[in-house]
């Protein structure tokens, strides 16, 4: 019996009946065994077939078999109901070997020419399976020459049997207070040969509750408890299960904050598995009762571990822990069932006693001493000498706890001194130097510090004076002895003020003329305004209309009198403004250098002389009455003049204040 080629020889060739293409002889038996490499099969087809036809091919036949299985018994030339001829059919071995047997009996009624066949080895596609057969691989099958291999979808690993995909379903940890977990692929069938471990791990104090939901289908056995696939639930206290079958297990209240769920499957079966919805509970905290005028948020039926609530107060009420204010309040429920913070109160906002208003007073409008939310107070300034700046003085206690004006300001109103008030009324005629009476020149300031000089009070903490009068003290402000509220230069009864700082105009050059002869002294304390101490007004934009040539101004001071001594009593003189060109001309001739009189100066006095300010008056104010406001304002500052005060044809020269309003305002606002 010829054995045919064996692998690793090339596996292909031709087979033919003995004597082909001639007729075959009687009593012939020929057998061929063909062997292909592993993973290959043999393909065989006939190019010629002519054998004696007999019932069930009992006489002459060709038999194809693979292993123990007969693939075909062939005879005749064409197939009948009970006999088969190969025709154009191709035959395949079941494995890698194919046996071909040819037999002829003892006689033939007529000559038959036999058969010719060709064979070859070809790769088996193991991935193709017949309908109804189990698939080669669980997930993905990959064919290649001489074999195949299996692979798995993400989340699975190939079992050591090389065909089954086991789920990678261990190590999942659930830390939320509730959630869902299920068998892999649920509700589709769960994978075989898998071992899944799930952990629920909550904070200490929580207790996990397990509910099986929807459906439950785990392979079971009628007699033995869950021998194939099973689900087990383990806590630190006890074990539940194993579970299998088709009945939903009951709710499990674990009384534990940690749970381990184990699911093991074997190599067979087709079941949908299980789904668990888990929740948790804990010892509830006492129900939070909102304080009066407050509310709790969020509102819940109960509050357990980690739950929290906040307290919000109604408008006009504030959170307080005793006397201590809180912007917000949130309490958290602890594992022992207590809140981590005590309940605060919602107390009505109390703005507290309003601050005292310097030079003013406060009146309780809502009721005596009432300082709570929506209470109203009224600030007012001391009449006559002070006026309220910016607002109307009405303040309301608002929800933020601050007294707030109708304009929304939280700062106190300001009582600004009324300026330019004088007990004196001006006459229309010029008369000689006079003694001042109380209240005539309440802005008058006496400056002592090396020499005697004067100044004028601005607001309640500034003095306007001449730069030359305080130049020596510019670096030692505290050396200035500032007195006000008195008429007598040597009187012990005066209001004392001290200088905090001296500001000399940056354009002033000492001993080089008197241009920009202006300075400001900042007092270290505000002075109390009264009929004897009142600030002078600064000139309005329109003030020039009251300071034209021949308009009358008044100069006051304790300077030298005609007798050549400093005045004991405050003196004043009413003098007219002199035409600027006339004044400039008067000081053009020697000993005065050209340009002595600048645009920053104004002149006042009589052509005939006799009425003038003099040494010791320096820095004092030359004041004018604003007939529209009926207030006195400073038009000039006593600066310089002829060597002989009151000399005919010479005039007193004064710093022109209106030119310096921006400078004055800047200094005062900056400091």
């Amino acid at each position: 019996t010829p054995l045919g080629p064996k692998w690793p020889e090339p596996v292909f060739g031709r087979l033919a009946s003995p004597g082909f293409p001639g007729e075959y002889a009687n009593d012939q038996e020929r057998r061929w065994t063909l062997t292909a490499p592993p993973g290959y099969r043999l393909r065989l087809y006939f190019t010629h077939f002519d054998l004696e036809l007999s019932h069930l091919c009992e006489y002459d036949f060709v038999k194809l078999s693979s292993g123990a299985k007969v693939l075909a018994t062939l005879c005749g030339q064409e197939s009948t109901d009970t006999e088969r001829a190969p025709g154009k059919d191709t035959f395949y071995s079941l494995g890698s070997s194919l046996d071909i047997t040819f037999r002829s009996d003892y006689s033939n009624e007529k000559p038959f020419t036999g058969f010719e066949a060709f064979y070859a080895a070809e790769d088996i596609d193991e991935c193709q399976v017949a309908p109804g057969e189990a698939p080669t691989c669980d997930h993905h099958c990959h064919n290649h020459l001489g074999g195949f291999y299996c692979s798995c979808r993400a989340g699975y690993v190939l079992h050591r049997n090389k065909r089954t995909c086991s789920a990678l379903c261990s190590g999942q940890v659930f830390t939320q207070r509730s959630g869902e977990l299920s068998s892999p692929e649920y509700p589709r069938p769960y994978p075989k040969l898998s071992s899944c471990t799930y952990s629920i791990s909550l904070e200490e104090g929580f207790s996990v509750i397990l509910d099986f939901v929807e459906s439950f289908d785990v392979e079971t056995h009628p007699e033995t408890l869950c021998p194939y696939d099973f689900l087990k639930i383990q806590t630190d206290r006890e074990e539940h299960g194993p579970f299998c079958g088709k009945t939903l297990p009951h709710r499990i209240e674990t009384k534990s904050n940690t749970v381990t769920i184990t699911f093991v499957t074997d190599e067979s079966g087709d079941h949908t598995g299980w789904k668990i919805h888990y929740t948790s509970t804990a010892q509830p905290c006492p129900y939070p009762m909102a304080p009066p005028n407050g509310h709790v948020s969020p509102v819940q039926a109960k509050y357990i571990l980690k739950d929290s609530f906040s307290i919000f107060c109604e408008t006009g009420y504030e959170l307080l822990q005793g006397h201590l204010p809180l912007k917000s309040f949130t309490a958290v429920c602890q594992k022992d069932g207590s809140w981590d913070r005590p309940m605060p109160a919602c107390s009505i906002v109390d703005c507290g006693p309003p601050d005292d208003l310097p030079s003013g007073r406060v009146e309780y409008i809502t009721g005596p001493g009432v300082t709570t939310y929506k209470a109203v107070i009224q600030y007012s300034c001391e009449e006559t000498f002070y006026t309220m700046k910016v607002n109307d003085g009405k303040y309301v206690c608002e929800a933020d706890g601050f007294w707030t004006s109708s304009k929304g300001e939280k700062s106190l109103p300001v009582c600004e001194p009324v300026c330019g008030l004088s007990a004196r009324t001006t006459g229309g005629r010029i008369y000689g130097g006079q003694k001042a009476k109380p209240g005539d020149f309440p802005w008058q300031v006496l400056i002592l510090g090396g020499t005697t000089a004067a100044g004028a009070l601005l607001y309640d903490n500034w003095v306007l004076t001449a730069a030359h009068a305080v130049y020596e003290q510019k670096h030692d402000a505290s050396a200035l002895d500032i007195r006000m509220g008195t008429l007598k230069r040597l009187s012990p009864h005066y209001t004392q003020a001290w200088s905090e700082a001296v500001f000399i105009h940056e354009g002033y050059t000492h001993d080089a003329g008197f241009d920009n002869d202006i300075a400001l002294i900042k007092l270290n304390n505000k002075v109390v305004i009264n009929s004897n101490i009142t600030p002078i007004c600064l000139p309005r934009k329109e003030a020039e209309s009251f300071m034209r040539t021949d308009d009358i101004g008044t100069a006051s001071g304790w300077g030298l009198t005609q007798r050549g001594f400093l005045a004991r009593n405050l003196m004043y003189v009413d003098i007219p403004i002199v035409d600027h060109q006339k004044c400039t001309a008067a000081y053009e001739k020697p000993p005065y250098p050209r340009g002595s009189v600048t645009a920053n100066m104004l002149c006042a006095g009589l052509e005939s002389g006799g009425k003038d300010s003099c040494r010791g008056d320096s820095g004092g104010a030359l004041v004018f009455l604003d007939s529209e406001t009926e207030r006195w304002f400073v038009g000039g500052i006593v600066s310089w003049g002829s060597m002989n005060c009151g000399e005919a044809g010479q005039y007193g020269v004064y710093t022109k204040v209106i030119n310096y309003i921006p400078w004055i305002e800047n200094i005062i606002s900056d400091f």
């Epitope: 822990q321 006397h323 005590p342 706890g401």
Partner: antibody, heavy 114, light 107 residues
């Protein structure tokens, strides 16, 4: 972590003013709570001086009301104590503290002496 | 002003003892009382607030109780590091006031 740190002159002459600063890190003074000044006299007696709240409102010990001022600089997360007209009786260790005292500074010692 | 009285200036005790430090308010302060521990040269360390609430990080051997006018700080199983001065504070009303302190010392 919330931290408070006091700073000040250490020595002040009688009748002068005292200014102390409390610098806060790890928490904004406008977020919540009252921010207190507390002092401890020699002999360990503690005295609450006053607070400034998250909103800027102040509350003072009535015994100091005429001399005390508590202010703040929210941009620097600092609050300040000013005490005018000090006497030797104001010699103490000065602490700043939050809320009911859940956080304290380490204290700064002040001596009032001529 | 509310006066906080700590009647015992000193308490003599032993390691492992249970010690109670008391504080009495001159009028009702609700539960607005705090307790502090102070060692020489250190700032006060918060222990208890709102009479009964333990501050974070404070060992559970420290317990606060009381309300209204009578308050107690209890230290169970006293440790050597607990030997210090203990001061109460009421923060119910202005001005906030401290007790004079109670010092724990070894017998």
């Amino acid at each position: 972590e919330v931290q408070l740190q006091e700073s000040g002159p250490g020595l002040v002459k009688p009748s002068q003013s005292l200014s102390l600063t409390c610098s806060v890190t790890g928490y904004s003074i406008t977020s919540d709570y009252a921010w207190n000044w507390i002092r401890q006299f020699p002999g360990n007696k503690l005295e609450w001086m006053g607070y400034i709240s998250y909103s800027g409102r102040t509350s003072y010990n009535p015994s100091l009301k005429s001399r005390i001022s508590i202010t703040r600089d929210t941009s620097k997360n600092q609050f300040f104590l000013q005490l005018i007209s000090v006497t030797t009786e104001d010699t103490a260790t000065y602490y700043c503290a939050r809320y009911w005292g859940d956080y304290w500074g380490q204290g700064t010692t002040l001596t009032v002496s001529s | 002003d509310i006066v906080m009285t700590q009647s015992q200036k000193f308490i003599s005790t032993s390691i492992g003892d249970r010690v109670s430090v008391t504080c009495k308010a001159s009028q009702d302060v609700g539960g607005h009382v705090a307790w502090f521990q102070q060692r020489p040269g250190q700032s006060p360390k918060p222990l208890i607030y709102s009479a009964t609430f333990r501050h974070s990080g404070v060992p559970d051997r420290f317990t606060g109780s009381g309300s209204g006018t009578d308050f107690t700080l209890t230290i169970s199983n006293l440790q050597s590091e607990d030997l210090a001065e203990y001061v109460c504070l009421q923060y119910n009303s202005n001005p906030l006031t401290f007790g004079p302190g109670t010092k724990l010392e070894l017998k």
